[in-house]
């Protein structure tokens, strides 16, 4: 169901008057340099806004903070700075919001020159705060146990690991020289520590420790660790192999009790591994190429995280800034978008609809011409701007956007040609999860999805002050404008409650003034634009991943097809906060598409058959599994993790125990005698850059 064309756009009657009555201005009597927002809880309407003003004076930074609180989705704010005793709050730590609807908030104060620090904590959605003195200075934001928000974990600037079991009132030191710490499942804490050195210069000599009882006891689960990461059910560690500076990935699915060596290439000092995405079924792993190439190979794992298939070559992932365009399209199952660096050093966008099984270019939007990058003016593709373009300071204000409850909708900046263009991009929309695209807006914009896709809102990206917002009630086909203020403001951001269920949008910015610029927010409630609640007649049945309606298997992805109830484009109504996506799955027959190439096999381009890797032809396929050397008998296929197909094609696959001992125990990796060969291509390493682009783990 691609975006319908040719429909005349008639504006909604009385829209301006309806919106004017639902536009709420709040001027903050505040000169601060930055503002950070946090929604406290889901559907509570509570927003905290922390403004910070920092001025470097000689060798020190003087700062002040103001805290504001809204209970009505940002329509009005109250200055509650007195609740934090007018203390300067560290903006780099932001506002730490507790998991689920706990109502917990932590603000970390900047107590310059002191040996300890101070936090302000709230358990009532920011209505009141109490302050607690810390016996340490935090190195990063304090983290909550995802399953018990009273339990907090903190790493100090002296690399000590601290824990509180009573929401910050009392703290106990768990460990010294801790380099990285993370919450695992069920209150487990994993951390790397260096028993005889520092964190900075001894990577590769770290111990991976685990505690399941909040620090009463510890277990060393791995040694010679470079870094570790958690993704889905998997615990990964990059381990020094004993061959000089090479590292290899080991994986555990039982919280580190047992480990297996992942069948991935080893990497050297200048390379890295990165988990691009992970769930309980599988992992997308990027393995960096040797040398400063700026690309590597994406591998997809089996359900144990051990055997990997090459998914995509020349995957763009810069080592310098740690930028990759890898994007999970959350509005349609199995869809991912990323960029590759082609042989001519141009950057091209690729999309997969089957969780990495096959990658293709994005189809050219029908209402667009091929640009100057296209050799053939009739044949080209859409190329999407994401993190890499943003890092290169191109005129791209936002990364691609999709929401799980706005089924099929993907919005992104892009250009149409043979590669990504440095020219000013336009905004494109797909309403079918990335199969087809339409130019939605001319030039760069900020955009957001409201009411589960019932409304899309956009603001033009401009260096000049703005006072106009654009909105669409038909998934980006037709747009109306609304002048939300007479006096234009310098726009700094669009803010809406996470989850895309709200009908409120806040436009943040600051005033242009002969006196002082002040922070200002305009919150617009679209409830009167979508006057009525949607009814059954407003929805239509849509088959996801449909490319050939004549084919019985049409829509089959990962072994099943899904029919969704989608809002009709012509319906102007409220999905509502409680809207739940209605979908009907049905199982498909198995075909070769439901299988990945097994260890030692690969799929030639544009072929569904798996063939043996030339370098492994005639070799026994052996690898190390749970400390035994295994022999693999296979005709080259294994079921894609999460694939639900039944019947149909069923390739033979058998693993035999060779009764030979081998080890993937990294407590002594030099004893490994496995004859395993890595899958073709690539190599790897790990940093922590989660927040920036939702990458699970990067060495």
């Amino acid at each position: 169901r691609s975006t319908e064309q040719g429909e005349s756009c008639s504006g909604l009657l009385g829209a301006d008057a309806k919106l004017a009555g639902n536009t709420h201005q709040h001027i903050f009597n505040d000169l601060s340099g930055s503002v950070s927002l946090a929604w406290v809880g889901d559907g509570t309407g509570v927003i905290l806004a922390l403004t910070t003003f920092q001025v470097p004076i000689f060798m020190i930074t003087i700062g002040q903070s103001k805290l504001y609180r809204s209970e009505d989705y940002g329509k009005s704010f109250e200055d509650v700075t007195n609740l934090i005793n007018n203390t300067f709050i560290r903006s780099d730590f932001g506002i730490a919001i507790g998991p689920e609807n706990s109502g917990k908030v932590i603000l970390t104060a900047d107590v310059s020159g002191s040996h300890g620090s101070r936090i302000f904590v709230s358990s009532d959605f920011g209505k009141s705060f109490t302050h607690q003195e810390l016996p340490f200075v935090p190195l990063m934001q304090i983290t909550y146990n995802p399953e018990n928000s009273n339990v907090l974990l903190a790493l100090s600037n002296k690399n000590e690991l601290w824990l509180s079991e009573d929401f910050g009132t009392n703290w106990k030191k768990l460990y010294d020289t801790v380099c990285l710490a993370k919450w695992g499942r069920k209150g487990t804490i994993f951390f790397t520590a260096n028993h005889n050195g520092s964190c900075s210069n001894d990577r590769g000599m770290l111990e991976l420790e685990r505690t399941t009882d909040y620090g009463k006891s510890f277990k060393t689960v791995a040694s010679k660790i470079y870094s570790f990461g958690l993704g889905g059910k998997f615990l990964f560690a990059s381990v020094m192999t004993g061959k000089g500076t090479l590292r290899a990935i080991h994986v555990s699915v039982d919280d580190g009790d047992t480990w297996n060596m992942a069948q991935l290439p080893s990497v050297g000092q200048e390379q890295f591994y990165s988990i691009l995405a992970a769930n309980d079924d599988m992992v997308f792993m990027h393995v960096d190429e040797p040398g400063d190439t700026g690309f590597g190979t994406i591998f997809t794992s089996d359900d144990r995280g051990i055997v990997y298939s090459k998914s995509l070559d020349r995957h763009l992932y810069t080592t310098t800034g740690g930028e990759t365009d890898f994007t999970n399209v959350t509005s349609l199952r199995g869809v991912y978008i990323t960029s590759v660096l082609s042989e001519d050093n141009s950057i091209q966008t690729m999309i997969t609809f089957d969780q990495g099984g096959r990658w293709t270019h994005l189809r050219k939007p029908e209402n667009s011409e091929c640009d100057a990058t296209a050799k053939n003016k009739n044949e080209c593709s859409l190329h999407i701007h994401a993190s890499y373009s943003i890092s290169q300071k191109l005129n791209v204000p936002m990364a691609p956007l999709s929401e799980p409850n706005a089924v099929g909708i993907v919005i992104a900046h892009g250009s149409v040609g043979d590669a990504i263009s440095v020219m000013v991009p336009d905004v494109y929309i797909s309403d079918d999860g990335g199969y087809s695209w339409t130019k939605m807006l001319e030039g760069p914009h900020y955009y957001t999805i409201l009411d589960s896709g019932g409304i899309i809102v956009a603001i033009e990206h401009s260096s000049r002050p703005i006072n106009v917002i654009k909105f669409s009630t038909d998934e980006g086909q037709c747009w109306q404008t609304y002048t939300f203020t007479r006096d234009p403001i310098y726009f700094t951001g669009l803010a809406s409650e996470p989850g895309a269920r709200s009908m409120n949008i806040s436009i943040w910015g600051f005033t242009e003034s002969f006196l002082t610029s002040q922070w200002v927010s305009y919150t617009i409630d679209f409830k009167d634009i979508l006057e009525r609640n949607c009814e059954e007649k407003d929805y239509t049945i849509w088959l996801a991943h449909s490319t050939d309606p004549e084919d019985y298997e049409d829509g089959c992805i990962l072994g099943y097809k899904e029919q969704f109830l989608r809002l009709r484009k012509s319906s102007v109504c409220q999905n509502g906060r409680d809207y739940v996506v209605t979908k009907q799955p049905s199982i498909c027959l198995c075909s070769l598409e439901d299988f990945l190439c097994d260890f030692g096999y690969y799929r030639p381009e544009n072929d569904s058959k798996c063939v043996e890797q030339p370098e492994l032809k005639g070799h026994d396929l052996e690898f190390c599994l749970y400390g035994r050397e295994e022999h693999l008998t296979t005709n080259g296929y294994r079921k894609i993790p999460g694939d639900k197909c039944q019947g149909g094609v069923n390739p033979v696959r058998e693993v035999k125990d060779l009764k030979k001992k081998c080890t993937s125990n990294f407590l002594s990796p030099e004893k490994q005698n496995s004859k395993s060969n890595g899958s073709a291509g690539g190599s790897g390493g790990l940093n922590d850059i989660f927040e920036a682009q939702k990458i699970e783990w990067h060495e």
């Epitope: 340099g33 004076i57 600051f510 242009e512 610029s517």
Partner: antibody, heavy 117, light 112 residues
Framework: EVHLVESGGDLVNPGGSLKLSCEAS????????MSWVRQTPDKRLEWVAM????????QYPDSVKGRFTISRDNAKNTLYLQMSGLKSEDTGTYHC??????????WGQGTLVTVSA | DVVMTQTPLTLSVTIGQPASISCKSS???????????LNWLLQRPGQSPKRLIY???KLDSGVPDRFTGSGSGTDFTLRISRVEAEDLGVYYC?????????FGAGTKLELK
């Protein structure tokens, strides 16, 4: 501490041009409106030009309109006053001032401009 | 243009005694936003001007509370409850409600 340092003042012939600069420090320059105010030899104060925080809007009194141009470079924390068609009555000490909730909250020490044949 | 008239032009005082300066504008200084943009500045000998009071009665930071500003519309007054030696200099009132912004001619506060 707010610091405003003017420079560029000189002796210039009538009809000549001059560009004054004001370097700002100790505050976030880009969020404040700024003005130039001159003090004449008889100690009278005259507002000369004003620019908004982002540099979008400017204002001048009729006495200098069309001859003076105020500008700012927020990346460099610097305010400018380009003066042309100078007259003897433009002689004075030119002060750079920062605004806040009202006008002329902070003043620089000034730079002397003398227009004389 | 709005004319700002200060009286007296010179005020001779004794240390420790009160002092009062008047400023009258030719038009009301009440802005449409409800604020009245009337400032008082002090220029000590050999220094650049320094703002003491803004929006009629608000004291700038570091200004002693012996200074008070009052008035509305077109009539404004600066009072010093007890003059100290550091208060000597020329006092200017200025308005910022109407363009062009204008200053009074100044009142010189000197020792008797």
């Amino acid at each position: 501490e707010v610091h405003l340092v003017e420079s560029g003042g000189d002796l210039v012939n009538p009809g000549g041009s001059l560009k004054l600069s004001c370097e700002a420090s100790g505050f976030i320059f880009s969020i404040y409106g700024m003005s130039w105010v001159r003090q004449t030899p008889d100690k009278r104060l005259e507002w000369v030009a004003m620019i908004s925080s982002g540099g979008i809007y400017t204002q001048y009194p009729d006495s200098v309109k069309g001859r003076f141009t105020i500008s700012r470079d927020n990346a460099k924390n610097t305010l400018y006053l380009q003066m042309s068609g100078l007259k003897s009555e433009d002689t004075g000490t030119y002060h750079c001032t920062r605004h806040d909730d009202s006008w002329f909250a902070y003043w620089g020490q000034g730079t002397l401009v003398t227009v004389s044949a | 243009d709005v004319v700002m008239t200060q009286t007296p032009l010179t005020l001779s005082v004794t240390i420790g005694q009160p002092a009062s300066i008047s400023c009258k504008s030719s038009q009301s200084l009440l802005d449409s936003n409800g604020k009245t943009y009337l400032n008082w500045l002090l220029q000590r000998p050999g220094q650049s001007p320094k703002r003491l009071i803004y929006l009629v009665s608000k004291l700038d930071s570091g200004v002693p509370d012996r200074f008070t500003g009052s008035g509305s519309g077109t009539d404004f007054t600066l009072r010093i409850s007890r003059v100290e030696a550091e208060d000597l200099g020329v006092y200017y009132c200025c308005q910022g409600t109407h363009f062009p912004l204008t200053f009074g001619a100044g009142t010189k506060l000197e020792l008797k």
